[in-house]
């Protein structure tokens, strides 16, 4: 559940993401079928650079509806190739 994920992230707060935590997050997201808004909100709360650490291919699978969870500062450290994927999603999210 999302609460279990939050508890796990709380224990690791302030530490770099370990391979074990990364694997659990990956399984959690895959189990949900996509990186939904609530999950993304939770992840970026603990890991502000989460989106910018993903590949453009991974970012392309983030549904536009989840972009509502993203704050401008979450994208501060993304590179242009990542932003090329995220900006159209943001426009689409705000149009809808």
């Amino acid at each position: 559940s999302l609460e279990t994920l939050k508890a796990l992230l709380e224990v690791n707060k302030g530490h770099e993401m370990s391979p074990q935590v990364a694997t659990l997050i990956d399984r959690f997201v895959k189990g949900r079928g996509q990186l939904d808004k609530d999950t993304l909100d939770t992840l970026t709360a603990f890991y502000p650079g989460y989106l910018c650490s993903l590949s453009p291919e991974e970012l392309s699978s983030v549904p536009p509806s989840s972009i509502w969870a993203v704050r401008p500062q979450d994208l501060d450290t993304c590179d242009p190739r990542q932003l090329d994927v995220l900006y159209p999603k943001a426009r689409l999210a705000f149009q809808n």
Epitope: G14, M17, A22, Y47, G49, Y50, C52, S55, E57, T77
Partner: nanobody, 116 residues
């Protein structure tokens, strides 16, 4: 403590090649994107290239596409930038950037000068 160190800079003639390396020490364990930026005197840092944690996919600025090749050895926490067909416009300090879900780490930079 995470440390990022660049090496391989130097003076090269136009049309020449140079290989930059970036080493990361410390606990950068998962999900990191590694990038090269460059900065010329008085200018903002310009993104050059990225290599992403998932599948090693890459991205390049238009100004270096087809000339520069970014690669990484995740086991050694190393990244390289092979720079070919160098131009005077490539003269800059090149910085390695390591993006994790938690932080962004920068190196001190390495100077590349392209001049005849």
């Amino acid at each position: 403590e995470v440390q990022v160190v660049e090496s391989g800079g130097g003076l090269v003639q136009p049309g020449g090649s140079l290989r930059l390396s970036c080493g990361v020490s410390g606990s950068i364990l998962a999900l990191n994107t590694m990038r090269w930026y460059r900065q010329t005197p008085g200018n903002q840092r310009e993104w050059v290239a990225s290599i992403y944690s998932s599948g090693g996919s890459t991205g390049y600025a238009d100004s270096v596409k087809g000339r520069f090749i970014i690669s990484r050895d995740s086991a050694k926490n190393m990244m390289s930038l092979q720079m070919n067909s160098l131009k005077s416009e490539d003269t800059a300090v090149y910085y390695c950037n390591v993006q994790t879900p938690l932080n962004v780490y920068w190196g001190q930079g390495t100077q590349v000068t392209v001049s005849s």
